[in-house]
């Protein structure tokens, strides 16, 4: 009688993370008389995967009944696969032995791949904001991907970039891979409203690629210019200053006036308009009464934008021409607004 | 080398459950076969338990089977043994033991590295 084959048909199988493995065997005689084990691995370092004779396996069940007399068939199904599981299986005939069975015939082995997706890309940005003409990193994170070759791209406002770095680890082979790219921006003052989008295709995918999202508005502050004007008189005594703060992002905004290098006002900045960009817009207005005065005043508009060290706008009020009232010493009325309630 | 060490033994009362773990050091952890075995006073050691590498496979004692179950995390370098309605006579030493190659049951020849041990009493 011809001796026994361990038939292995399946050089490879390629399974989605998730779903079950199906490794086909088969043996050409029930002689010689004894178990069947499945190892991952050849070699002494391999792992026992499934033994007929004793074991708990909850995710291994036999396609057969293996109890059978006359049973000839030793497929096993892995359930739940994880890219962990890659590997080559094979299928291996023990002869009845004492103490000990003894090893009699492998099967030919059969390579488990395993397909797994990558994880949703993480964007991240700095940790602390920049201004427009700086240049700024993104980076983009996924996971627990295989096999190991993937596409990644990043976008800005649906423009493709082309100043990253992106790498692949580990070099070797693994189970699973993970994909790093850092890419540079350079900020422009239209930003707010700009987005960075990284993009990962796989062949898990089938051709919808993941993408990870950063909003500019986190990373990018536009200061603020500043322009300080007198207005017409509204009253014999009384000068009208406003100081236009504008485009300006994020909202956080103090001003303060000084008159003559002294504290007048200091304000918040809250009804602010929006401009198209996504800046703001701000004006702040003092009253100033002329007659509290003998000389020329210095009125500064004085900004802390974002944390930032202050930036200031001075104007010089000329008081000589105006009559000097007696009795009075208010020099400005501490009333501030915003440009909707101005006049 | 594979340095092993147990922890999280104690005195419990009978039909308690206690968990067991030992992390594992000194070697790809990933690449090793585990197991737990006792010595009870005057008794020679016993497998408890053991789990192959990537965790798809377990063994266990007869007398321990559906009480116990063994479990791994391959990236803490730890082996657990969770031991369900305790009896007295589960009073012993339970060590934890690696292996670079591991037949099932035959895991106490093959065991390579061994810990110090951690008492569990089980008082009625």
């Known amino acids: 009688e011809e001796e026994l084959q361990v038939i292995q048909p399946d050089k490879s199988v390629l399974v989605a993370a998730g779903e079950t493995a199906t490794l086909r065997c088969t043996a050409t005689s029930l002689i010689p008389v004894g178990p069947i084990q499945w190892f991952r691995g050849a070699g002494p370092g391999r792992e026992l995967i499934y033994n007929q004779k004793e074991g708990h396996f909850p995710r291994v069940t036999t396609v057969s009944d293996l109890t059978k007399r006359n049973n000839m068939d030793f497929s096993i199904r892995i359930g739940n696969i994880t890219p962990a599981d890659a590997g080559t299986y094979y299928c291996v005939k023990f002869r009845k032995g004492s103490p000990d069975d003894v090893e009699f015939k492998s099967g030919a082995g059969t390579e488990l791949s395993v397909r797994a997706k990558p994880s949703a890309p993480v964007v991240s940005g700095p940790a602390a904001r920049a201004t427009p003409q700086h240049t700024v990193s993104f980076t983009c994170e996924s996971h627990g991907f295989s096999p190991r070759d993937i596409t990644l791209k990043w976008f800005k406002n649906g423009n493709e970039l082309s100043d990253f770095q992106t790498n692949v680890d580990p070099v070797g082979e693994s189970v699973s891979y993970s994909i790093h790219s850092t890419a540079k921006v350079v900020l422009t003052r239209e930003d707010v409203h700009s987005q960075v989008i990284c993009e990962v295709a796989h062949v898990t995918l089938q051709g919808d690629p993941l993408r990870g999202t950063a909003n500019l508005s986190e990373t990018i502050r536009v200061p603020p210019t500043l322009e300080v004007t007198q207005q017409p008189v509204r009253a014999e005594n009384q000068v009208n200053v406003t100081c236009q703060v504008r485009k300006f992002y994020p909202q956080r905004l103090q001003l303060t006036w000084l008159e003559n290098g002294n504290v007048s006002r200091t304000e918040t900045a809250s009804t602010v308009t929006e401009n198209k960009d996504g800046t703001y817009n701000w004006m702040s207005w003092l009253l100033v009464n002329v007659s509290a005065h003998r000389d020329d005043v210095k009125l500064t508009c004085q900004v802390e934008h974002d944390g930032q060290p202050a930036v200031s706008k001075s104007h010089d009020l000329k008081v000589s021409a105006h009559p000097k009232e007696q009795g009075s010493n208010t020099a400005a009325e501490n009333t501030g607004s915003n440009e909707r309630n101005i006049y | 080398q594979v340095q092993l060490q147990e922890s999280g033994g104690g005195v419990v009362q009978a039909g308690d459950s206690l968990r067991l773990s030992c992390v594992a050091s000194g070697r790809a952890f990933s690449s090793l076969d585990m197991g737990w075995f006792r010595q009870a006073p005057g008794k020679e050691r016993e497998f408890v338990a053991g789990?192959?590498?990537?965790?798809?496979?377990?063994y266990y004692a007869d007398s321990m089977k559906g009480r116990f179950t063994i479990s791994r995390d391959n990236a803490k370098n730890l082996v657990y043994l969770q031991m369900n309605s305790l009896k007295p006579e589960d009073t012993a030493v339970y060590y934890c033991?690696?292996?670079?190659?591991?037949?099932?049951?035959?895991?106490?020849?093959?065991?390579?590295?061994w810990g110090q041990g951690t008492q569990v009493t089980v008082s009625s």
């Open positions: 033991a690696a292996a670079l190659t591991f037949r099932g049951s035959d895991l106490p020849r093959d065991s390579n590295y």
């Open positions: 789990i192959s590498r990537s965790g798809i496979s377990q």
